[in-house]
């Protein structure tokens, strides 16, 4: 009788292990579906916007090579500008080359004229080094022309053809950047 109970208990335990495995597999499957659905949704949105715009960038964004740029229509301080970009799945503009700088300044001239636009550049308070938001250093030709006299945190902005610096708490327009979606055509 005791042996019979022991056998039943073992069978129940085996069944429980199988159910746990099944549940784990289901959880993984569900996660996989969620991921696929996210990609699928992004692909559908891209396909729809491409059908309407023939563009790998969202509406009101400008494309140059692999990047999409958004020039804000509102002013904000540097930190809020960064958050506004993140809401759109982008970051403040990181200028990688003189070619990109020329494209940006040329586009700004056409759109708005000579205003101030925050970019993703800030000065480390301890070392005084300029760094882009991903932690990389700007190339020598892309360092702000003037050192701000502010005792507060200092951030970089674009005006006309120049990269300048200012107290991060001042209000300016801003430029967001994200990767352009590649066309599969």
């Amino acid at each position: 009788k005791l042996l019979q109970v022991s056998t039943i208990a073992m069978q129940q335990q085996e069944k429980l292990i199988q159910q746990e495995r099944a549940l784990l597999n289901f959880t993984e499957w569900k996660r996989s579906c969620a991921l696929q659905m996210k990609y699928c949704q992004a692909f559908m949105q891209n396909s729809l916007s491409s059908a309407h715009n023939s563009s790998p960038c969202p509406n009101n964004w400008i494309q140059n090579r692999e990047s999409c740029y958004y020039v804000s229509e509102i002013w904000s301080i540097w930190h809020t500008s960064q958050e506004n970009c993140l809401k759109e799945g982008s970051t403040l503009l990181q200028i990688e080359s003189k070619e990109e700088m020329d494209f940006i300044t040329g586009s700004l001239r056409k759109i708005k004229g000579s205003y101030d636009y925050w970019v993703g550049l800030s000065q480390d308070g301890h070392s005084g080094r300029w760094l882009w938001q991903d932690g990389s250093s700007p190339s020598p030709g892309l360092l702000p022309a003037e050192r701000s006299q502010s005792a507060n945190q200092v951030c970089g902005y674009v005006k006309s053809n120049s990269l300048l610096s200012s107290n991060c708490s001042t209000w300016k327009y801003f430029i967001c950047e994200k990767y352009a979606l590649r066309s599969s055509v």
Epitope: A34, L86, E88, G89, Q133, D134, Y179
Partner: nanobody, 115 residues
């Protein structure tokens, strides 16, 4: 709605490491970026690091070179690897999901760096 659950906080000594995790659930398709914020007693909540759905990363000046933000393959868990921790990193760390509409916050996890 998006739900966020942080974990991984604790008490460590200066120079040690800690890894925070934030799992997102619910309407994760609406998330465009995820970030970590921190708030020390008597101070404002500040952005520490963020990562967009395209993989672009952003860091606060004070953590550049020490902290690394990343996500899992599914994109619904974000991690903050914190190395070379300093006493000034002591704070409650909050996870935030950025969407075009609302922003969603986690409950927070305490990180204390003390010898």
């Amino acid at each position: 709605q998006v739900q966020l659950q942080e974990s991984g906080g604790g008490l460590v000594q200066p120079g040690e490491s800690l890894r925070l995790s934030c799992a997102a659930s619910g309407s994760i398709f609406s998330i465009n970026a995820m970030g970590w914020y921190r708030q020390a007693p008597g101070k404002q909540r500040e952005l520490v690091a963020a990562i967009t759905d395209g993989g672009a990363k952003t860091y606060a000046d004070s953590v550049k070179g020490r902290f690394t933000i990343s996500t899992d393959n599914a994109g619904n868990t974000v991690y903050l690897q914190m190395d070379s921790l300093r006493p000034e990193d002591t704070a409650v760390y909050y996870c935030k999901a950025f969407t075009r509409g609302n922003d969603y916050w986690g409950q927070g996890t305490q990180v204390t760096v003390s010898s």
